[in-house]
């Protein structure tokens, strides 16, 4: 991670490889532009930083103290003024193309290998969750630790959040709370649940007020998941800061040991942000450290937190792991994901704001086989008699997709990919076997949602003693 | 699906001049730097040109500066070559390539099927 | 005469290992990554390695390649006959400020 110390040039042209590589991986797979445009800028800022700290520019497959030959290759100073998009830009498009062993490679994080997977069930006594299965939740940083502690009876909680930018929610926001409850329930460990809506005031043209609206909207959906309401605090940035010393001390504290130049390098600010964007990373990182949270955990500052996230997540908790041994405080735990695929595949960015792109919490079963039908992107031939023959690619393929992500039913599944892949299977039979997966699934979120009244909300989100027994 | 669909090619006579058009699509263009890369008959490879994804960088082969000039339209998802004062060594197959790389590293993951330049009196 | 020298032919049978060569100099391969296309007759050319050793997707793992200085290379395991086509190295180079690639190495499956 890169820092301002002259040992960690290396580990930031380390971090320019790695942001280079996710950079290529979602070029080759077709990303959106904006998800595009978002990694190059965080990697355009990478170059800038190390220049700064080299007194050269960054040379690719060219690691500092092997010098190179003086170049002029590569973008002009200009490069840097194409248009971007910030790094916060929801990034949930598919991950065709994207090879998760050499990400974990390049992050230096560690493979949820079968090992591992069969340790997490004989500590919890639980099958292992679809998710961890078939490898959509694919890597980690110190799980085994985690997994050290519980089985000694230490102590851990769960944090996860989500970034209220607008009351639409689709199904790929679900996968961090769907495998969060998960683990809730097989580990009965406590669960904060962080909604930045203090950074989306910062990052999109909202009102306080709205900001805080689509926290509570959101937190009705993330409710709706089924999290114990005993065991769980769902929190407000904008609401809780104010109301938590413990909190606010944390927060200065990270703050105070993180350098502009290291958040410049991960997040890809620039001199006109605002400062309220430059020290956010911050408020992200605080509830990492149990005293934030005197409520539930008094003011222990060695209870190890467990963090599932997408890995286009783990940037920002790299730093929080960087910073922690120099406030005194545990590292977190990560558990990451792969990225969720928008119906059109790879090439489309899944966005709020483009009602086809996914399949949203509030659409009805008619819209949800009409968008299948219409909008998934099929891995199916031209023609019935060549998909007999040469049967259809299911990596491509985002009905089969959203199955492994839906479809609990491991044999199933197998009998589907079998028999699509074969060709015995057409594309119009693979959907709806998607759309009676999605249905139900959906029909029973809305109706959980409706018994989520404004007195639960409130319930879940007032700070308050969690019951768990921890030594 | 990813295309790239080069034209513009044909006979033209030493001295004169052709622009070539790369037609791109299934993909994000404006994301992606793009190149030339040509090929005379029975001969290698050698690379003509590239262009960022924003078109503020620009770089040639020495055999072709002064002479070529690449540009893109992005709001048209093209890819351009002008080529003036062509000689009889700039008779090749013209492929335009899509790099995926993040720093024009010539990463060329998608090429398109080319066309024949011929200069000849 | 390219920059990048790759031996202009080289074959193998059916089974076996076959290695082709890149050499080129610090500023280029020694301080860039080494791409390799394979070009099929007739037809264009397609990434086959990238970033020095990365295959991408759907490259069979029959063919790796590898970096050491100045030079690279590209070794195809498990020979089959639809590997004959003729394979090229590219890297960039700092002091011409422009993509190079090798003369092209036409592999021969007898």
């Known amino acids: 991670m890169p820092n301002s110390e002259p040992a960690s040039l290396l580990e930031l042209f380390n971090s320019i490889a790695t942001q280079g590589e996710l950079v290529r991986s979602l070029k080759a797979g077709n990303a959106s532009k904006d998800e595009i445009d978002s990694a190059v800028k965080m990697l355009v800022s990478l170059k800038m930083s190390y220049k700064a700290a080299a007194g050269e520019d960054y040379k690719a497959d060219c690691p500092p103290g092997n010098p190179a030959p003086t170049s002029n290759h590569g973008p002009d100073a200009t490069e840097a003024e194409e248009d971007f998009v910030d790094p916060w830009t929801v990034q949930t498009s598919s991950a065709k193309g994207i090879d998760y062993d050499k990400l974990i490679v390049r992050f230096g994080s560690s493979k949820i290998d079968k090992e591992l997977i069969n340790r997490i069930e004989r500590a919890t006594g639980q099958r292992p969750h679809h998710f961890l299965r078939r490898g959509i939740f694919f890597s980690h940083r110190d799980m085994n630790q985690v997994l050290d502690a519980y089985e000694n009876k230490k102590p851990f909680y769960l944090y996860t959040g989500r970034g209220p930018s607008s009351e639409a929610m689709h199904v790929g926001h679900l996968i961090p709370f769907i495998f969060t409850k998960w683990l809730q329930d097989v580990f009965n460990v406590p669960l904060v649940i962080q909604m930045t809506d203090d950074e989306k005031y910062l990052w999109k043209d909202l009102t306080l007020d709205q900001a805080y609206s689509y926290a509570v909207e959101n937190a009705k959906d993330i409710i709706a998941c089924g999290f114990d309401i005993n065991k769980t605090f769902i929190f407000s940035d904008l609401d809780y800061m104010g109301m938590s010393s413990g909190f606010y001390k944390n927060v200065v504290k990270i703050q105070k040991h993180v350098t502009f130049n290291q958040v410049k390098g991960i997040f890809g600010f620039t001199d006109s942000d605002c400062i309220g964007k430059i020290s956010f990373p911050a408020i992200q990182a605080a509830p990492s450290f149990s005293n934030s949270f005197p409520q539930i955990f008094r003011d222990r500052t060695d209870i190890q937190c467990l963090i599932p996230c997408a890995i286009d997540q783990d940037p920002y908790f790299r730093m929080t792991r960087d910073v922690a041994p120099r406030i005194g405080y545990p590292k977190p735990a990560l558990l990451h994901s792969t990225f969720f695929p928008a119906l059109q595949g790879a090439q489309t960015k899944m966005s709020a704001s483009d009602p086809n792109s996914s399949i949203f919490l509030t659409d009805t079963a008619k819209q949800i086989k009409t968008k299948v039908n219409k909008h998934a992107f099929s891995g199916g031939r031209d023609t019935i008699e060549e998909h007999r023959q040469f049967g259809g690619n299911c990596d491509v393929d985002v009905s089969f997709m959203y199955l492994t992500f839906f479809l609990e039913d491991d044999d199933k599944l197998e009998q589907i990919r079998k028999d699509y892949t074969s060709g015995a299977m057409l594309t119009g039979e693979l959907k709806k076997a998607l759309i009676e997966v999605l249905q139900p699934l959906i029909a029973e979120h809305q109706a959980r949602r409706k018994e989520v009244t404004d007195e639960i909300v409130k319930e879940f989100m007032t700070p308050r003693k969690l019951s768990f027994d921890f030594q | 699906e990813v295309q790239l669909l080069e034209s513009g090619g044909g006979l033209v006579q030493p001295g004169g001049s052709l622009r070539l058009s790369c037609a791109a699509s299934g993909f994000t263009f404006s994301s992606y730097d793009m190149s030339w890369v040509r090929q005379a008959p029975g001969k290698g490879l050698e690379w003509v040109s590239a262009i960022s994804s924003g078109g503020s960088s620009i770089y040639y082969a020495d055999s072709v500066k002064g002479r070529f000039t690449i540009s893109r339209d992005n709001s048209k998802n093209t890819l351009y070559l002008q080529m003036n004062s062509l000689r009889a060594e700039d008779t090749a197959v013209y492929y335009c390539?899509?790099?995926?790389?993040?720093?024009?590293?010539?990463?060329?993951?998608?090429w398109g099927q080319g066309t024949l330049v011929t200069v000849s009196s | 005469q390219s920059v990048l020298t790759q031996p202009p032919s080289a074959s193998g049978t059916p089974g076996q290992r076959v290695t082709i060569s890149c050499t080129g100099s610090s500023s280029n391969i020694g301080s860039n990554y080494v791409y390799w296309y394979q070009q099929l007759p007739g037809t264009a050319p397609k990434l086959l390695i990238y970033a020095n050793s990365h295959r991408p997707s759907g490259v069979p793992d029959r063919f790796s390649g590898s970096k050491s200085g100045t030079s690279a290379s590209l070794a195809i395991s498990g020979l089959r006959s639809e590997d004959e086509a003729d394979y090229y190295c590219?890297?960039?180079?700092?002091?011409?400020?422009?993509?190079?690639f090798g003369g092209g190495t036409k592999l021969t499956v007898l």
């Open positions: 390539a899509r790099d995926v790389a993040w720093d024009m590293l010539g990463d060329f993951d998608y």
């Open positions: 590219g890297a960039w180079d700092d002091s011409l400020s422009a993509y190079v």
